[in-house]
């Protein structure tokens, strides 16, 4: 017995017609079961399979192979958080954070907490002390003076 188009099984009473639209993206196997087209999954074959590696938590897709990031996330796989705008020497674990690297401080991690080490401002053998963000003090050897022991 040969079934009519789109009918399958004993008695030809199983219906399956391929679709590729809002309601699903599937073909039909020899038994009339829905088989999702490449790039689609789910019982209704209407959920796209995202780019391999796309973060299941922070990325999604409406088309196969895509990876669209949630607000606050970036990168090819949507696995990198976006730090606070203007964050200079900082990183984030969650969106909009600015966690300062060593020796940096301030809301945007733009304040140097180790000005002495970074800039070595004290001349002529002066001893540098960090006194605050972007602040330092030079202790000058005998015979020298000025903010940087330059005189």
């Amino acid at each position: 017995v040969t079934c009519d188009d789109y009918y399958y099984g004993f008695g030809c009473n199983k219906f399956c017609r391929p679709r590729d639209d809002f309601f699903g993206h599937y073909a039909c196997d020899q038994n009339g079961n829905k088989t999702c087209m490449e790039g689609w999954m789910g019982p209704e074959c209407n959920r796209a399979i995202c780019r391999q590696g796309c973060s299941p938590k922070h990325g999604s897709c409406k088309l196969p192979g895509d990876c669209r990031c949630q607000y606050g996330w970036q990168g090819l796989y949507c696995d990198k958080c976006i730090p606070h705008p203007g964050c200079v020497h900082g990183i984030c674990n969650e969106p909009w954070q600015c966690l300062c690297e060593t020796n940096w401080g301030g809301q945007l991690c733009d304040k140097d907490l180790n000005y002495c080490g970074t800039h070595q401002p004290c001349l002529n053998g002066g001893t540098c002390s960090n006194t605050g963000p972007d602040k330092y003090q030079c202790s000058c050897p005998e015979g020298y003076s000025g903010p940087n022991c330059e005189i």
């Epitope: 789109y6 009918y7 009473n13 199983k14 219906f15 017609r17 809002f22 309601f23 789910g42 019982p43 209704e44 209407n46 959920r47 999604s60 409406k62």
Partner: antibody, heavy 116, light 107 residues
């Protein structure tokens, strides 16, 4: 077991809006679309629209297009249907149903009465 | 929109009778057709999907046939619990529409 539990009856004035909820359990919420169907007293069934619960995309019956909004909250496995600018002819029982080769599962229905 | 014409709109029959309800569509919907049974105050119940597939738990006295534009729901031997209203619905394209219903009453 699969269950769709809808919010309680509503009495609304003409011009107001109503938002009906449909909380599902017993299966993965985002695996199946949710449809909304209504039935006026003593009348037949009328399909209002469908929402893809994974993406939140909706397709509406043109008759309701400008007045209906379907949404989902994946965190609570709940679908919502909001109908605005209500008029007396919107008095009906509103059903949600799980879509896939026919509606095997329905909510219990929510009666919305529109009266001044 | 696809129009669904269901007939008859009402029908009187007796227990044990064979009953046929028809549904005609305004264009080819292949087999994207569903039949429901509804009792007063209750949500509809799925009987048949894809024109002829019996839904889980539905008695075998119910059967569906047809494809394209002409469809039939048959109850081979009416039981007392079968007196209800029956609806056809297509799920081919948006909007999915229902037939007007057939009220099956006891003669």
């Amino acid at each position: 077991q699969v269950q769709l539990v809808q919010s309680g009856a509503e009495l609304k004035k003409p011009g107001a809006s109503v938002k009906v909820s449909c909380k599902v359990s017993g299966y993965a919420f985002t695996d199946y679309a949710i449809h909304w169907i209504r039935q006026a007293p003593g009348q037949g069934l009328e399909w209002m629209g469908i929402i893809n619960t994974y993406y939140g995309d909706s397709k509406y019956n043109q008759k309701f297009k400008d007045r209906v909004t379907m949404t989902v909250d994946k965190s609570t496995s709940t679908a919502y249907m909001e109908l605005s600018s209500l008029r007396s002819e919107d008095t009906a029982v509103y059903y949600c149903a799980r879509g896939y080769d026919g509606f095997a599962y329905w909510g219990q229905g929510t009666l919305v009465t529109v009266s001044s | 929109d696809i129009q669904m014409t269901q007939s008859p709109s009402s029908l009187s029959a007796s227990v044990g009778d064979r009953v046929t309800i028809t549904c005609r569509t305004s264009e080819n919907i292949y087999s994207y057709l569903t039949w429901y049974q509804q009792k007063p105050g209750k949500a509809p119940k799925l009987l048949i999907y894809n024109a002829k597939t019996l839904a889980s738990g539905v008695p075998s006295r119910f059967s569906g046939s047809g494809s394209g534009t002409d469809f039939t729901l048959t109850i081979s031997s009416l039981q007392p619990e079968d007196f209800a209203t029956y609806y056809c619905q297509h799920h081919y394209d948006i909007p999915w529409t229902f037939g007007g219903g057939t009220k099956l009453e006891i003669k």
